[in-house]
Amino acid sequence: TAGTIDTKRNISAEEGGSVILQCHFSSDTAEVTQVDWKQQDQLLAIYSVDLGWHVASVFSDRVVPGPSLGLTFQSLTMNDTGEYFCTYHTYPGGIYKGRIFLKVQESSDDRNGLAQFQ
């Protein structure tokens, strides 16, 4: 095979916190030309070797490029729970996709508070 993508399939983070979305592409021959990050079908960000980074305006206050070709997703909400996809465009070698499932959990403070209230 020309290349492979490794990623943590399932990750979790606390509401209000941040998480790093990271895919690792390895190949003996193919070079990465672009990486697309999507939340389900919605574009999060693009990294292009030629053009640099682009973060979709709807996420620009919460998504920070890096580390490396990954993303740091900040100020997480419960609505951010779901599937995230990295798409690596390579040459030669074509396109490789990785999938991450992010589970955003209530913060421990919220959970403790709720327990005390009950």
């Epitope: 292009s48 053009l51 640099g52 980074w53 890096g66």
Partner: antibody, heavy 121, light 112 residues
């Protein structure tokens, strides 16, 4: 001599369409990423669109969904199909080559002379 | 988008004197993985397309006279023309490409 020559500009009404072409010569066109950059009269420069040597495409938000970039490596040509044109698209449109010597510098090293697009009723 | 702010808007300098143009980006353009600043400078003469002068903030493009030099890192950059020549009259633009490319508004250099 390394050269880029644009054509296809002209006067078009708002909502209309235009197709720009850029003919490349003097270098191995298929090996280079290419761009369209525009300049409104008396204004600064604005990157519009990009196509890599392998066909990966990107657009500025201001033209996404209206403009389509393409290339024909057999003809050493770059194209920009412009639909749903607006008055604010009025500009000189340059094709520009990405500099790829060394590692990617993300700079534009060769520019054409430009073609003028005027959107007006 | 990163906003690139150039100053001054225009500059009048005597022949043989130094011209200094500043460019400030709203975010850092230093890419930590290779320690390169993705900042380029272009020269545009009337009726002509832009010409690449400098990339990676300080690397001169082949064929560009050594009186042109670039410096700076992170968010603050400078283009210096050490000894202005008549043929240097032009508008100068900075361009970042840490994010998708954006250009500064330009600085017009004239002879005093």
């Amino acid at each position: 001599e390394v050269q880029l020559v644009e054509s296809g500009g002209g006067l078009v009404q708002p909502g209309g369409s235009l197709r720009l072409s850029c003919a490349a010569s003097g270098f191995t066109f298929s090996s280079y990423s290419m761009n369209w950059v525009r300049q409104a009269p008396g204004k600064g420069l604005e990157w519009v669109s990009y196509i890599s040597s392998s066909g990966t495409i990107n657009y500025a938000d201001s033209v996404k969904g209206r403009f389509t970039i393409s290339r024909d490596n057999a003809k050493n040509s770059l194209y920009l199909q412009m639909n749903s044109l607006r008055a604010e698209d009025t500009a000189v449109y340059y094709c520009a080559r990405h500099r790829i010597a060394d590692s990617p510098s993300r700079a534009f090293d060769i520019w054409g002379q430009g073609t003028m697009v005027t959107v007006s009723s | 988008d990163i906003v690139m702010t150039q100053s001054p808007d225009s500059l009048a300098v005597s022949l043989g004197e130094r011209a200094t143009i500043n460019c400030k980006s709203s975010q850092s353009v230093l890419f930590s993985s290779n320690n390169k600043n993705y900042l380029a400078w272009y020269q545009q003469k009337p009726g002509q397309p832009p010409k690449l002068l400098i990339y990676w903030a300080s690397t001169r493009e082949s064929g560009v006279p050594d009186r042109f030099s670039g410096s700076g890192s992170g968010t603050d950059f400078t283009l210096t023309i050490s000894s202005l020549q008549a043929e240097d009259v032009a508008v100068y633009y900075c361009q970042q490409s840490y994010f998708f490319p954006t250009f500064g508004g330009g600085t017009k250099v004239e002879i005093k």
